[in-house]
């Protein structure tokens, strides 16, 4: 039939699978007189034959790995053997079959990894080759760990990138590997072709021996530094060391202190740069960071603890300029009048802040000196010699020396003699009834006023009333403030009420005096009152366990992969229904029952990372109250963007005719992430046919030069195809076109006669 298997002599391309015995002809060329016979030349490899009558066939199986393309020429000859037509190019493309197994470049690999290395950071690559076509599944390799020895608790410490063969630690490996427990591991790695997806794939295995080395990047022991040091600063206090030389060290002050008195040098030695004051700050926690030459952290930061040791550099201080106590006129010897509590800013529970009290003067000395004594260490004042009489001396003044081991301070005490406390406070009501409040009643609200009266001497400790809640409020949700002029008690809310834990509280108040009652008088039922607090439920919104939930996944995760989850609880114990808000790209879905978040579309880091959405937790039932939290999905880069030209290069031209070879510079970019060093592109011409006229040479990782090889160019536009490879894993290649025009120039610009097409080149080279 004309067309598919036969026809006139013209350039043609045929595709034939390798490894197949010939079963039919390739093509029957028809001769046009005066042509009578055909001749075949080129890369025949004694496989391709053309019969005189034009029948093109092959006589044995092809092998793509020997030659992937056979470039043949067919010519038509007349009766005298002279070419009358052609030769025309005939291209035979050999299609790949999976007839080669992958082979590891080494039967054994050796590597080492430091304990606590970052999970996912490759420390070793295994590499296999497969002679089959990498553009087809036949040559696409898939790496896998077959076994890890030893395997502890069924936990994998190592992982391999299926595509690149990069071996790294898992999260468990990073945390648990310890050379003291297990200094070496063996992995058996397999590689399969067909992307690992076919039962018919070929495979190979290799052995990997891994040595675990000690990580000396460890936090030093906590440091103690004496305050107010007079030694010359800076003073070395500790050190950190990265595992290899050349690390750049720095300190990070997480507390953002106004002054940060520490520094680190490039050996990793840590210094205190100025004297410390324990009373200003008694401890410091900061971090030491090691970075590589590009400023990238080599590992996690180390926590440095510095404790500031106390010296006795603070004298005791009095609680107030004058401390006032009251004593009833009939009080018995030894009774406590009050306690003077002085302070010392030095470290608690040490000799530097341990205080002694001593009375140095009493005025007036009536009826005698030494009426009072003070407990040396406790500061408690007691009546020492006799009962006092208000009409004789209504007031005494004491000077008290308070001392620590180095300093002395004088404090002043005024003691007022008051009438005896022989009357108890009496509540005006014994039962204040029921009070119903919503659980969201504001803190600080006054919810009840209570009143007791006391017939003792007004405005003294004998008649002053203190109200205490002695029953029904173990959580301390309520408090009572007293008006000192009227002895009215105001019951206030100190902590939030909670229907769920305390719906009904039976509260009991006690009214008492700060002064002790005289001997024989006791508080009775008149000094007690009660009331019942009933708390009503207010439906509260669910509460998320975090304000922001964060997850990290590779941008090429399969659709349906779980990428994170959120949790919320409802105070009333109702179930939660979760939903997403602001998923503008339609990438995610949330399981409304569990809060798990799944991908439902391909993710793309280059579209923006992190991807931020809101998660909504709604209580199921009730009043359907809801709360909102953030979910941030950090997308980790994969090499999925081929290189391209960094800008528009239309309008490039050379003045025709060229007087000497010329060149121009162009820049490439891609949208993938290039940490620290930037891209590392390689450049080549896009097709072999361009090599006679052009050459491309790399300038750096992003720029290349396109040069002419000669000066014999026509006056027209040439489109130069350039292949740019990003060297990634896997490598991606972009073929870009640079249009270059050779034109007549006037004053260094392209000249076009009037009426010529628009869009003339404007950049001369």
């Amino acid at each position: 039939q004309e067309g598919k298997f036969s026809g006139p002599l013209k350039p043609m391309t045929f595709s034939i699978y390798e490894g197949q015995e010939p079963s039919q002809i390739i093509f029957q060329f028809k001769a046009n007189p005066p042509a009578v016979t055909f001749e075949l030349t080129g890369e025949t490899d004694n496989i391709f034959v053309i019969e005189r009558e034009g029948l093109l066939y092959y006589n044995r199986a092809l092998d793509r790995e020997t030659r992937s393309t056979h470039n043949l020429q067919v010519a038509a000859l007349d009766a005298n053997g002279i070419i009358v037509e052609g030769p025309v190019p005939i291209t035979i493309k050999v299609k790949d079959i999976n007839d080669n197994r992958p082979t590891f470049l080494q039967s054994k690999y050796e590597g080492s990894v430091r304990q606590n290395s970052r999970p996912g950071k490759p420390f070793l690559y295994v590499n296999a080759t497969d002679l089959d076509d990498p553009a087809t599944p036949n040559g696409q390799l898939y790496y896998q760990i077959v076994i890890q020895l030893p395997m502890i608790n069924n936990v994998m410490y190592f992982q391999i990138n299926n595509k690149t063969g990069a071996i790294s630690l898992t999260r468990e490996g990073s945390q648990e590997l310890n050379p003291a427990k297990n200094p070496s591991y063996n992995l058996v790695i397999s590689v399969k072709d067909m992307g690992g997806q076919s039962e018919n794939s070929f495979s190979d295995t290799t052995s990997v021996d891994i040595i675990v080395t000690e990580n000396i990047w460890k936090a030093p022991k906590p440091v103690e530094m004496v305050e107010n040091s007079t030694d010359p600063h800076p003073i070395k206090i500790t050190q950190v060391r990265w595992n290899d030389p050349g690390a750049q060290y720095s300190l990070v002050d997480k507390e953002k202190l106004p002054r940060f008195p520490f520094s680190i040098d490039q050996e990793g030695d840590i210094y205190v740069t100025q004297p410390l004051d324990r009373e200003e700050k008694d401890a410091y926690v900061f971090y030491a960071v090691a970075k590589d030459e590009y400023g990238k952290p080599l590992s996690y930061p180390l926590e440095i603890h510095v404790k500031v040791k106390d010296i006795n550099d603070n004298p005791p201080t009095c609680p107030s300029p004058v401390t006032v106590f009251e004593v009833q006129e009939n009080e018995r010897l030894g009774n406590s009048i009050g306690t003077l509590t002085a302070h010392d800013r030095d470290e608690e529970n040490t000799a530097n802040s341990f205080l002694n009290y001593r009375i140095v003067e009493q005025t007036p000395k009536l009826p005698m000196d030494g009426l009072f004594l003070i407990q040396t260490y406790a500061g408690m004042l007691q009546l020492a010699k006799q009962s006092l009489k208000k009409q004789d001396t209504p007031q005494y003044n004491l000077t008290i020396e308070v001392s620590d081991k180095d300093f002395k301070t004088l404090c002043f005490v005024q003691i007022n003699v008051i009438d005896i406390n022989d009357q108890i406070p009496i509540f005006e009501k014994s039962d204040y009834g029921n009070l119903t409040l919503a659980e969201d009643t504001n803190i600080g609200s006054t919810i009840l006023t209570i009143q007791a009266t006391d017939a003792d001497e007004p405005f003294t400790g004998s008649s002053k009333i203190l109200y205490h809640i002695i029953k029904g409020d173990s959580e301390g949700r309520l408090g009572v403030d007293t008006d000192p002029h009227t002895n009215t008690g105001y019951v206030i809310i100190k902590k939030p009420l909670d229907f769920e834990t305390a719906a009904v509280s039976n509260i009991v108040f006690k009214a008492e005096n700060p002064e002790p009652l005289v001997f024989g008088v006791k508080y009775n039922a008149s000094s007690f009152a009660k009331f019942t607090l009933i708390v009503t439920d207010v439906n509260e919104a669910p509460q998320f366990s975090q304000h922001v939930f964060q997850a990290k996944v590779s941008e090429d995760v399969a659709i349906g992969t779980k990428v994170g989850n959120v949790t919320a609880k409802d105070p009333e114990g109702l179930d939660i229904s979760y939903s997403l808000r602001g998923d503008t790209r339609g990438w995610l879905k949330i399981d409304h029952v569990t809060g798990e978040i799944f991908s439902v579309a391909p993710l793309d880091r280059e579209a923006g990372s992190p991807y931020r959405v809101q998660v909504v937790a709604t209580e199921v039932g009730g009043s359907s109250l809801s709360s909102v939290s953030e979910f941030h999905l950090i997308l980790m880069d994969v090499n999925d963007n081929p290189p391209r030209l960094a800008k528009d290069y239309t309008g490039l031209f050379f003045c025709h005719p060229l007087s000497a070879p010329g060149s121009l510079i162009f820049e490439a970019t891609d949208d993938d992430q290039h940490l620290f060093r930037g891209p590392h592109f390689t450049f080549s011409l896009g097709s072999g046919s361009l090599q006679n006229d052009w050459e491309v040479s790399k300038i750096n990782g992003t720029h290349a030069r396109l040069s002419t090889r000669h000066t014999e160019f026509e006056e027209r536009e040439y489109v130069v195809l350039i292949r740019i490879n990003d060297g990634g894993r896997p490598p991606l290649e972009g073929i870009v076109s640079l249009p270059v025009t050779f034109c007549s120039c006037v004053e260094g610009s392209c000249f076009r006669p009037a009426g010529h097409q628009t869009g003339i080149p404007t950049v001369g080279m």
């Epitope: 779980k562 989850n565 109702l574 179930d575 229904s577 939903s579 399981d591 409304h592 029952v593 569990t594 798990e596 709604t618 199921v620 039932g621 009730g622 359907s624």
Partner: antibody
Framework: QVQLVQSGAEVKKPGASVKMSCKAS????????MHWVRQAPGQGLEWIGA????????SYAQKFQGRATLTVDTSTSTAYMELSSLRSEDTAVYYC??????????WGQGTTLTVSS | DIQLTQSPSSLSASVGDRVTMTCRAS???????LHWYQQKPGKAPKLLIY???NLASGVPSRFSGSGSGTDYTLTISSVQPEDFATYYC?????????FGQGTKLEIK
Amino acid sequence: QVQLVQSGAEVKKPGASVKMSCKASGYTFTSYNMHWVRQAPGQGLEWIGAIYPGNGDTSYAQKFQGRATLTVDTSTSTAYMELSSLRSEDTAVYYCARGRGRYFEYWGQGTTLTVSS
Amino acid sequence: DIQLTQSPSSLSASVGDRVTMTCRASSSVSSSYLHWYQQKPGKAPKLLIYSTSNLASGVPSRFSGSGSGTDYTLTISSVQPEDFATYYCQQYDSSPSTFGQGTKLEIK
């Protein structure tokens, strides 16, 4: 008391669709998730999916995604499950169950579905 | 998906016996989201124990549950005639919710 009453038995041909119902009473329909679970003859229980009648949110087991559709009619307190592209292995008893705290507190009596050519 | 494996798949007991059955998860499950059901032939399943150890309303105290992580247990302290049935464990820690294949308790 809480009751879930399911529609009657169904016989369908392969490739067809079926829609079964579950009428709830004795509680506030919109205040609890409704789950669907099936049990093939002589086999264990298999969760199909859940719907929250309060706002229509649904979750499905991956296996049933795209083939099962859960809906509700809050005016009649009825939940529905539609299963399309039926095959013989869909022959089972289908239960609706009221959810609470991620467990299934009350169950319907079940709807028997037979798929046969 | 989390797989639940129940063992034994069946067991025989006499009235008054103490029986224990286990449910093992392929990965860790929060004890709040592991539940047990009882099913009798031709009937719908019935909630028995929720959140590992809490008895559902009306369930006799001879039933008890325990466990954490990947291993959970259902115990009947003294089997009664009405207890002969199939028992299923269920997890809903992560979606999809999954059930064990069941343990059938038969009369010896």
